[in-house]
């Protein structure tokens, strides 16, 4: 329904303090360079004008759109060109054209510091002093760094955090009270970060279809005992909240969200009989449990899905009459059957079936031609199934540290030309599916690798798309989303690159390592490894462990030194020209 | 949505010829391929011919082969059946389908072949 004053309508909906924080998550992705006390002066402005339209509706721009509202207000701030350069050249256009210009200019990597935590005293100090600022710095400065996250989520971890803070900061030994728990959190958000950004890639890439494909797979297996009609509507819906929230229509998004966590609960009966505890829960709860409930139990007698896809006369009748809802029904049937695999997989088979279709059923005789499809499937089955079993076969093997290794030289070997940055952060991230996927049972292994794999991707693909260097990737990028993973998978070592002459202050490191958090003692050490495989791209798993052994005993020696900037000035040189000697 | 509907049959002698059409619509034509179809009265349906998207490649039942040409107008969406030397047993309902199906989703048209 029609409402007059849309931003009256939202503020109503979704109450005071959901909608402060969305239109603060709005304005942080928008502009991410502005401060938290810029931003928080634009909110508190929208939010009383949105009161003044609430008490009126008639009253005097109340009845603009949220994005004439929002982008009049972002193109006031002072300043804006010296800051944001052209992202300013926004502000001469109109709507639609000016937030789709706005969406253009969010930037996937922005030069900002890492988010570090205040140390546990300090933090309780500003929480119980002002939770409501303490929670508004949080949601800016995770939503800048993450400029596509799904904002009601965001929405879901700020309350996350604030529950753990009110907790822990009510012990005695706050610092192990807040450490693990936080990491916890950080940890499931980022995941949440880059598996949100693929759904903005696919819908901004290859538009709302192929989004709806992959929500009509991903609840045909969370919702075995649902019909198609059912899952279509989800599907649908679904698609268009994530549709507004890629789309930085934050407000509508959160509110369509609500309604449809409140739609699947009062129809349970048809969707799902493992959603009652998620319905239980208050609203932000409610919807994170919904967005990961765990499957349904499959129906018993679910036939052969031949006797409809493949022996059935009417196949290409049925076809013929609407294909994408033939091609719905057969992922639904599919994806319904499968909850062991990936939604990738699932997606790649249905276009291997709409792609046999299209190949048989212009022939004299398709029955003949499509009655092996299924067959034909196989090898796409099995791809994936080995790749899992290798990776966890290796992870077990190897650890997180050592598996994540692995996966960096493997793939700095594949994509030489990418900055080492990129690839430290690639290999890390895709690293981890191992502690992630490796620990889950059988049947949860591949659809937790695969559809990880694929968003971690989907983000060096985008970092690529900034600066392209490498031919592989370009290649690898420019297919269709579900393809990705099995093109890098495929890749091999780039014979065209050049290797990089070696340089001695690239493995030259002092004192100050012996300091560092292990995780960044990680990262300086994985730097220099990808290093050594820029300058030897052919070197040896052998040649590299050696060197990479070496490195580590040198740093363990000269950590314990007594005078360790000596032990680094000597001992480092020679550690080079041993590294040097390693890989000759 | 799709529909079929087929033409040109009749009361015809022994020996005599008709030639069937069926306009299409609601679906890429040239993309699929295309049979005709007939059941005799108190029979099950029978296969008669079938021919490729591109019109290339054609198939016919051993009963009618060499008597028989099926042959479609991708530019004007219809599918014929050019019947020579008809024979009493060729009476049927003829019906066109959508890539081998048998099943009859179209009025069809009557060929009586009697002298």
């Known amino acids: 329904e029609a409402h007059k004053s849309e931003i009256a309508h939202r503020y109503n909906d979704l109450g005071e303090q959901h909608f402060k924080g969305l239109v603060l998550i709005a304005f942080s992705q928008y502009l991410q360079k502005c401060s938290y006390d810029e931003h928080a002066k634009l909110v508190q402005e929208v939010t009383d004008f949105a009161k003044t339209c609430v008490a009126d509706e008639s009253a005097a721009n109340c009845d603009k759109s949220l994005h004439t509202l929002f982008g009049d207000k972002l193109c006031a701030i002072p300043n804006l060109r010296e800051n944001y350069g052209e992202l300013a050249d926004c502000c001469t256009k109109q709507e639609p054209e000016r937030n789709e210009c706005f969406l253009q200019h969010k930037d996937d990597n922005p030069s900002l510091p890492p988010f570090e935590r205040p140390e546990a005293e300090a933090m309780c100090t500003s929480f119980k002093e002002n939770p409501t600022t303490f929670m508004g710095h949080y949601l800016h400065e995770v939503a800048r760094r993450h400029p596509y996250f799904y904002a009601p989520e965001l929405l879901y971890y700020a309350e996350q955090y604030n529950e753990i803070l009110t907790q822990c900061c009510a012990e005695a030994d706050k610092e192990s009270c807040l450490t693990p728990k936080l990491d916890g959190v950080k940890e499931k958000a980022l995941v949440s970060s880059v598996r949100q950004r693929m759904k903005c890639s696919s819908m901004q890439k290859f538009g709302e279809r192929a989004f709806k494909a992959w929500a009509v797979a991903r609840l045909s297996q969370t919702f075995p005992n649902a019909d198609f009609a059912e899952i279509t509507k989800l599907a649908t819906d679904l698609t268009k909240v994530n549709k507004e929230c890629c789309h930085g229509d934050l407000l509508e998004c959160a509110d369509d969200r609500a309604e449809l966590a409140k739609y699947m609960c009062e129809n349970q009966a048809t969707i799902s009989s493992k959603l009652q505890t998620c319905c239980d829960k208050p609203l932000l709860k409610k919807a994170h449990c919904l967005s990961e409930v765990e499957h349904d139990t499959m129906p018993a007698d679910l036939p052969a899905i031949a006797a409809d896809f493949v022996e059935d006369q009417e196949v290409c009748k049925n076809y013929a009459e609407a294909k994408d809802v033939f091609l719905g029904t057969f992922l639904y049937e599919y994806s319904r059957r499968h909850p062991d695999y990936s939604v990738s997989l699932l997606l790649r088979l249905a276009k291997k079936y709409e792609a046999t279709l299209e190949k048989c059923c212009a022939e004299a005789n398709p029955p003949a031609c499509y009655g092996t499809v299924l067959a034909e499937f196989q090898p796409l089955v099995e791809e994936p199934k080995n790749l899992v079993k290798t990776n966890c076969d290796l992870y077990e093997k190897l650890g997180e540290y050592g598996f994540q290794n692995a996966i960096l030289v493997r793939y700095t070997q594949k994509a030489p030309q990418v900055s080492t940055p990129t690839l430290v952060e690639a290999a890390r991230n895709l690293g981890r599916v191992g502690t992630k996927c490796c620990t889950l049972p059988e049947d949860q292994r591949l659809p937790c690798v695969e559809d990880y794999l694929s968003a971690i991707l989907n983000r060096v693909c985008l970092l690529h798309e900034k600066t392209p260097v490498s031919e592989h990737v370009t290649k690898c990028c420019s297919g269709s989303l579900v393809e990705r993973r099995p093109c890098f998978s495929a890749l091999t070592v780039d014979e065209t690159y050049v290797p990089k002459e070696f340089k001695a202050e690239t493995f030259t490191f002092h004192s100050d390592i012996c300091t560092l958090p292990e995780k960044e003692k990680q990262i300086k050490k994985q730097t220099a490894l990808a290093e050594l495989v820029k300058h030897k791209p052919k070197a040896t798993a052998e040649q590299l462990k050696t060197v990479m052994d070496d490195f580590a005993q040198f740093l363990d020696t000269c950590c314990k030194a007594a005078d360790k900037d000596t032990c680094f000035s000597t001992e480092g040189p020679n550690l080079v020209t041993r590294c040097k000697d390693a890989l000759a | 949505e799709v529909q079929l509907l087929e033409s040109g049959g009749g009361l015809v002698q022994p020996g005599g010829s008709l030639r069937l059409s069926c306009a299409a619509s609601?679906?890429?034509?040239?993309?699929?391929?295309m049979s005709w179809v007939r059941q005799a009265p108190g029979k099950g349906p029978e296969w008669v011919s079938s021919?490729?998207?591109?019109?290339?490649?054609?198939a016919y039942a051993d009963s009618v082969k060499g008597r028989f040409t099926i042959s479609r107008d991708n530019s004007k969406n219809t599918l014929y059946l050019q019947m020579n030397s008809l024979r009493p047993e060729d009476t049927a309902v003829y019906y066109c389908?959508?890539?081998?199906?048998?099943?009859?989703s179209s009025q069809g048209t009557l060929v009586t072949v009697s002298s």
């Open positions: 609601g679906f890429t034509f040239r993309s699929f391929g």
């Open positions: 389908t959508i890539g081998g199906s048998l099943s009859r």
């Open positions: 021919i490729s998207g591109s019109g290339s490649d054609t």
